[in-house]
């Protein structure tokens, strides 16, 4: 594959990454799949600077990110280490709350209205953000 040198149409470039901001809602798994089909992944927040950038673009709206603990440990979808990485949970979060009455706890992370993170039921239809790195090799064949 060829190396991607600029962002696709309707994607926003920032610090050698491209971001796409949804305006509709999907369950976390569907949002995750949407990004994968775009040769991208749900946004992985690695710094306060990136947090501010994403927050600026999504506004005060619940929005999925690429962080979940559905198989046990908290994991970023691109393999970034959760334990040593950037975190921006709301106070008292994540809490794996069972009181929502939907069955099970809360296994997927999202940006809340103030930008800080919360864990919530993965089936909730929130907006989402896809991210792909400009330096990453594209899956498309090079033009001959």
């Amino acid at each position: 594959g060829s190396e991607r040198t600029c962002c696709p149409v309707n994607w926003v470039e920032h610090e050698r990454s491209c971001y796409w901001f949804s305006r509709s809602g999907k369950a976390w798994a569907d949002a995750d799949n949407y990004c994968r089909l775009e040769d991208a992944h749900l946004v992985v927040v690695t710094s306060w600077e990136e947090q501010k950038f994403v927050q600026h673009h999504i506004g005060p709206v619940n929005t999925w990110m690429g962080l979940h603990d559905q198989n046990g440990p908290w994991k970023w979808v691109d393999g970034t280490d959760y334990e040593t990485g950037f975190k921006n949970w709301r106070p008292e979060q994540p809490d794996d709350w069972y009181g929502h009455g939907l069955g099970g706890g809360e296994d997927c992370a999202h940006f809340t209205d103030d930008g800080r993170w919360n864990d919530d039921v993965c089936q909730r239809p929130y907006r989402w953000v896809c991210e792909t790195e400009l330096d990453k090799a594209s899956q498309e064949p090079p033009l001959l």
Epitope: W74, E92, Q93, D95, G104, G105
Partner: antibody, heavy 113, light 107 residues
Framework: EVQLVESGGGLVKPGGSLRLSCAAS????????MNWVRQAPGKGLEWVSS????????YYADSVKGRFTISRDNAKNSLYLQMNSLRAEDTAVYFC??????WGQGTLVTVSS | DIQMTQSPSSLSASVGDRVTITCRAS??????LGWYQQKPGKAPKRLIY???SLQNGVPSRFSGSGSGTEFTLTISSLQPEDFTTYYC?????????FGQGTKVEIK
């Protein structure tokens, strides 16, 4: 590497008290629900109690409600189980578990006169 | 409270056999179920999460299926180290409840 090490088990008389501890390491303790599960000698597994990661929502099995108290200290990466009014039927190995995926090796509690 | 009925309580099989263990929930628990293996004197180890997803590092001969109230754990080809006890756990609502366990013995 995730590690959970239980301590505080031992022999206690019926009606007595015991406090179990679980020292956690190798992960961000404050990000996870923690549980106590027990297993009586030769028997199956029984969930005992659960505490949410930060806010401290606590849940108990009916068999221990009003007698056992679960707590955590996120600053010390530690989980606790205060057991009061102990009965012979509380005799078991008590396991500390991170959410649903990782378990310690357990500590034996024996309630006998 | 949700009751988990696990069957059989024990079974005898040979190396290479295909084995199926069942758990039935007393009400709909979606896919909020895990399967655990416990060897004597050891802590339980999770094999399957979310009813059908294989835990990292677990051999592919283990598989889970089901949703709602009926769940199965299948071992496609029993290995010597698989002769031990298995439990299901529902975590759809508190109190969490385990099945009674299934002991897999050598025939």
């Amino acid at each position: 590497e995730v590690q959970l090490v239980e301590s505080g088990g031992g022999l206690v008389k019926p009606g007595g008290s015991l406090r179990l501890s679980c020292a956690a390491s190798g992960f961000t303790f404050s990000s996870y629900r923690m549980n106590w599960v027990r297993q009586a000698p030769g028997k199956g597994l029984e969930w005992v109690s659960s505490i949410s990661s930060s806010t401290g929502y606590m849940y108990y099995a009916d068999s221990v409600k009003g007698r056992f108290t679960i707590s955590r200290d996120n600053a010390k990466n530690s989980l606790y189980l205060q057991m009061n009014s102990l009965r012979a039927e509380d005799t078991a190995v008590y396991f500390c578990a991170r959410d649903k995926d990782y378990w310690g090796q357990g500590t034996l509690v024996t309630v006998s006169s | 409270d949700i009751q988990m009925t696990q069957s059989p309580s024990s079974l005898s099989a040979s190396v290479g056999d295909r084995v199926t263990i069942t758990c039935r929930a007393s009400q709909d628990i979606r896919n909020d179920l895990g399967w655990y293996q416990q060897k004597p004197g050891k802590a339980p180890k999770r094999l399957i999460y979310a009813a059908s997803s294989l835990q990292n590092g677990v051999p592919s001969r283990f598989s889970g299926s089901g949703s709602g109230t009926e769940f199965t754990l299948t071992i496609s080809s029993l290995q010597p180290e698989d002769f031990t006890t298995y439990y299901c756990l529902q975590h759809n609502s508190f109190p969490w409840t385990f099945g009674q366990g299934t002991k897999v013995e050598i025939k």
